[in-house]
Interface confidence: medium
Amino acid sequence: REVEKTACPSGKKAREIDESLIFYKKWELEACVDAALLATQMDRVNAIPFTYEQLDVLKHKLDELYPQGYPESVIQHLGYLFLKMSPEDIRKWNVTSLETLKALLEVNKGHEMSPQVATLIDRFVKGRGQLDKDTLDTLTAFYPGYLCSLSPEELSSVPPSSIWAVRPQDLDTCDPRQLDVLYPKARLAFQNMNGSEYFVKIQSFLGGAPTEDLKALSQQNVSMDLATFMKLRTDAVLPLTVAEVQKLLGPHVEGLKAEERHRPVRDWILRQRQDDLDTLGLGLQGGIPNGYLVLDLSMQEALS
């Protein structure tokens, strides 16, 4: 809503941005606060309890001063005035400093990611060209689910070096398509680590691991827990032998019984010989009966 243009009353012209302004009516703020003064003293606004509608006036003044978008010197000090910005406003900005990003994320801390924040992050990441480690560190600190909100295409711009910033909880809501993109990057990032350390780091990315990597892990006494196993790709688990799964899970193999009706365990059981399943001594049922011939139909389809 436009604030009526009225002359500033005598003696009310603002010499600086200070607490006295909270007692100004909206039209007085419009008439008595110079936009250039506001821009140079933006850092003070955050400490002054302006009302919701007084902030509309201050925003309007900045919009008039910077119709092409605010400079970063102003953006960095927006404070809670940021909550008044629309995604359209933010698309005009060029935010390059991580400090600016942190300052604005701090304002929204504890809330869901708003459209404004999503736009801000998008502008920042696009400006940098890739999601570097420092940025990822910052974003996942404020929004643990951030990584999993990106599309597989966006994730492809994450350099392997950034994977070191990822914590297990950051991947909690990722789907298999996202893990398919992240797993090879993690494998590359952690390739110089020794067996047990490598497994600790790679574990939360294994939902994107292919069969051959799972076979290799089964040779390393990793003792994968059932929660991790249940998140593996079904197509990666199916070709594993009973012996390989037993080695992969170690003492956790007993947990298969409780999961025998759930994927990928259910589908894996259907592919195993019942004889082999019986060697586990867990009472797993549903394997291929003894004496039956197993045909690999996938090979036949590939040939026809």
């Epitope: 909270i22 007692f23 009516k25 955050n46 309890p49 302006f50 009302t51 809670y80 909550l83």
Partner: nanobody, 119 residues
């Protein structure tokens, strides 16, 4: 319409403490600035403390700086005034107020709670 109800007032000795509460009802006040005003007998109503709608910015009258603290709990629609090191001159009726506009227009008021500082 916003309804404001103050509580927590009473008689206290000089140097003592009180915590005033103001519960808002009728609509959420998360986008409103909240304030405490006071009016001593024979004097004009004066502003004591203000907190903005995010809980970030605060303002205190010079006479209470360092002694009083204003805070808010948006989910509970409540604002508080913690008053420490009370002095006899703090004796007044304390009013809670809310506005989205400015303190000189469109302000909602509570009924007030009496604070008496006396030995």
């Amino acid at each position: 319409q916003v309804k404001l109800e103050e509580s927590g007032g009473g008689l206290v000795q000089p140097g003592g403490s009180l915590r005033l509460s103001c519960a808002a009802s009728g609509r959420t006040v998360s986008a409103y600035n909240m304030a405490w005003f006071r009016q001593a007998p024979g004097k004009e109503r004066e502003i004591v403390a203000v907190i903005n709608w995010t809980g970030g910015g605060t303002y205190y009258a010079e006479s209470v700086k360092g002694r009083f603290t204003i805070s808010r709990d948006n989910p509970k629609n409540t604002v508080y005034l913690q008053m420490n090191s009370l002095k006899p001159e703090d004796t007044a009726v304390y009013y809670c107020a809310a506005t989205r506009t400015s303190w000189t227009e469109n302000t909602y008021w509570g009924q007030g709670t009496q604070v008496t500082v006396s030995s």
